[in-house]
């Protein structure tokens, strides 16, 4: 008898090379094989559970950056007046949540912020829990 | 044939709003659905393997905090003279281990330490390994 | 019907007690039960996917340390002029990758660097993906 295989784990790596002041970061998924999807610059959460979250990037100017998952809830990450980020966190997310950026710069210019090495990874930690597609 | 489902992963999120000097933190599990249990202010480990551990909180005064898992072993986390914590770690834990806090303040007062946003998450990383219930 | 079991997750914990200047660290796996293997002071990657990586250690002198996975690619970790490390990261690794150290000290002596508590943990986060043995 063939041993059971794991169904694919929900995970995604998105990249971002620019962020818009007072808005968010433009995220793209370099791989077609991701098990999670991007929609309207947000990562769509289909499965309830804990997620491992990794966030990296170097910014072309000092900014404040937050990563949100639900309106009216506090951010997953919040960094104030930084030129780079390299953080790891764990959070409980649920079906219908959407993970997205909010960015504010402190300059008078409203130009896009250039990002080098911008990467956001989400990995579901509770396969076997509730999912809806 | 229905594809195999994942059995639930061993994981838990506990909250703590106060810690007692020279003792530990009073932990509660907000969810009934957790796959791990709390007993005597300790999280009970039933399954051998690596665990992802996330610890967060803001304290009402400066303290030293350690997170232990076994008598005679070093702590999983040890923070000296801090007013907040936001840490992630990985550790190998085994059946019969118990994860618990030890807290010491540097004030002469022996009042409880109030905690804002106190959260401890454990997520098993080696399903398929040995478990005993 | 017996519920399906998880096949073992690819994971390993290696220890290192010394590093050689201009070379790497001598890694040993204390457990026979590891699901990943060490070869030529490198951890062999058999399965594509995200890996959770934990690196800890205290060094007998100031050094610069990098953890690589593939020739011509940037390091997983890069620490400059440190006497200790306690870092966690997430990275996408693939079959044929090899995880290994590079170490440089700033002393004129070419003696080995002694390491206390040197530990490197890798845990595969995408079971069900491609593996080759």
């Amino acid at each position: 008898q063939v041993p059971p295989q794991y169904p694919p784990i929900q995970s995604i790596r998105v990249q971002f090379t620019r962020c818009e002041n007072e808005k968010g970061c433009i995220i793209t998924s370099p791989s077609k094989d991701e098990t999670m999807k991007v929609q309207d610059n947000s990562i769509i959460i289909n499965c309830d559970g804990f997620y491992l979250i990794s966030l990296k990037g170097y910014f072309s100017e000092e900014l404040s950056l937050s990563l949100y998952y639900r309106k009216g809830r506090g951010p997953l990450f919040s960094l104030s007046k930084v030129t780079s980020v390299d953080s790891i966190g764990v959070a409980y997310l649920a079906f219908k949540d959407k993970v997205y950026f909010n960015v504010t710069t402190h300059s008078t210019s409203y130009k896009d912020i250039q990002v080098n090495g911008g990467e956001l990874i989400l990995i579901h930690q509770n396969p076997g829990g509730f999912c809806a597609y | 044939q229905v594809p195999p489902q994942y059995p639930p992963i061993q994981s838990i999120r506990v909250q703590f709003t106060r810690c007692e000097n020279e003792k530990g933190c009073i932990i509660t599990s907000p969810s009934k659905d957790e796959t791990m249990k709390v007993q005597d202010n300790s999280i009970i480990i039933n399954c051998d393997g690596f665990y992802l551990i996330s610890l967060k909180g803001y304290f009402s005064e400066e303290l030293s905090l350690s997170l232990y898992y076994r008598k005679g072993r070093g702590p999983l986390f040890s923070l000296s003279k801090v007013t907040s914590v936001d840490s992630i770690g990985v550790a190998y834990l085994a059946f019969k281990d118990k994860v618990y806090f030890n807290v010491t303040t540097h004030s002469t007062s022996y009042k409880d330490i109030q905690v804002n946003g106190g959260e401890l998450i454990l997520i098993h990383q080696n399903p398929g390994g040995f478990c005993a219930y | 019907q017996v519920p399906p079991q998880y096949p073992p997750i690819q994971s390993i914990r290696v220890q290192f007690t010394r590093c050689e200047n201009e070379k790497g660290c001598i890694i040993t796996s204390p457990s026979k039960d590891e699901t990943m293997k060490v070869q030529d002071n490198s951890i062999i990657i058999n399965c594509d996917g995200f890996y959770l990586i934990s690196l800890k250690g205290y060094f007998s002198e100031e050094l610069s340390l990098s953890l690589y996975y593939r020739k011509g690619r940037g390091p997983l970790f890069s620490l400059s002029k440190v006497t200790s490390v306690d870092s966690i990261g997430v990275a996408y690794l693939a079959f044929k990758d090899k995880v290994y150290f590079n170490v440089t000290t700033h002393s004129t002596s070419y003696k080995d660097i002694q390491v206390n508590g040197g530990e490197l943990i890798l845990i595969h986060q995408n079971p069900g993906g491609f593996c080759a043995y």
Partner: antibody
Framework: EVQLVESGGDLVKPGGSLRLSCVAS????????MSWVRQAPGKGLQWVAF????????TYADAVKGRFTISRDNAKNTLYLQMNSLRAEDTAVYYC???????????WGQGTLVTVSS | SYVLTQLPSVSVTLRQTARITCGGD??????VYWYQQNLGQAPVLIIY???NRPTGIPERFSGASSGNTATLTISGALAEDEADYYC?????????FGGGTHLTVL
């Protein structure tokens, strides 16, 4: 005092190879993002290659892609440019430049001359 | 790839205002950097992100950018300002310089 000192420039034949070095001092090199910029005799500046502080990202000008490799050794406070399959049009003074914010070239070296000629 | 266009040379009378332009497709949407290079010397950053001056750069240097043109303005040019000036932008982690403008102070 901040210093970037380039070396390794030489006369080399077309198709040959050369490795340039840039040694940094007076600042925390490992926290700075670094680039190579070149200037052909009597001409303007041309950006060549970039490496970020974590060595996780390298980018190249189209003119050198596949022939040049930028790297760094933070332990030695040194930036490198490995140049292969050199051409006459690669003749230039090569500057290393770096910034704490990745888009800035706050610090520059004085340059090293590379001449590609038969 | 992205192209930045500068006039090869600009002249200004001593203590008058010099304007050096840099043209590029919707350059106003990008952040522009300006460098000064004296003969035989390494370049020096004088303006970053369109309008900002690094510490130590005199107030007479200013920058602006909109539409398809970025401008470096030197208000009250001095003899020591005679040099080559280069504009620069970043585009998806690759960088482009303009061809450079030589400023002559008469």
């Amino acid at each position: 005092e901040v210093q970037l000192v380039e070396s390794g420039g030489d006369l080399v034949k077309p198709g040959g190879s050369l490795r340039l070095s840039c040694v940094a001092s007076g600042f925390t090199f490992s926290s700075y993002h670094m680039s190579w910029v070149r200037q052909a005799p009597g001409k303007g500046l041309q950006w060549v290659a970039f490496i970020n502080s974590a060595e996780s990202s390298t980018t190249y000008a189209d003119a050198v892609k596949g022939r040049f490799t930028i790297s760094r050794d933070n332990a030695k406070n040194t930036l490198y440019l490995q140049m292969n399959s050199l051409r006459a049009e690669d003749t230039a003074v090569y500057y290393c430049a770096g910034g704490y914010i990745w888009t800035h070239f706050d610090y520059w070296g004085q340059g090293t001359l590379v001449t590609v000629s038969s | 790839s992205y192209v930045l266009t500068q006039l090869p040379s600009v002249s200004v009378t001593l203590r008058q205002t010099a304007r050096i332009t840099c043209g590029g497709d919707i350059i106003g949407s990008k952040s522009v950097y300006w460098y000064q290079q004296n003969l035989g010397q390494a370049p020096v950053l004088i303006i970053y992100r369109d309008t900002n001056r690094p510490t130590g750069i005199p107030e007479r240097f200013s920058g602006a950018s909109s539409g398809n043109t970025a401008t470096l303005t030197i208000s009250g040019a001095l003899a020591e300002d005679e040099a080559d000036y280069y504009c620069q932008v970043w585009d998806s982690s690759t960088s482009v310089f303009g061809g450079g403008t030589h400023l002559t102070v008469l």
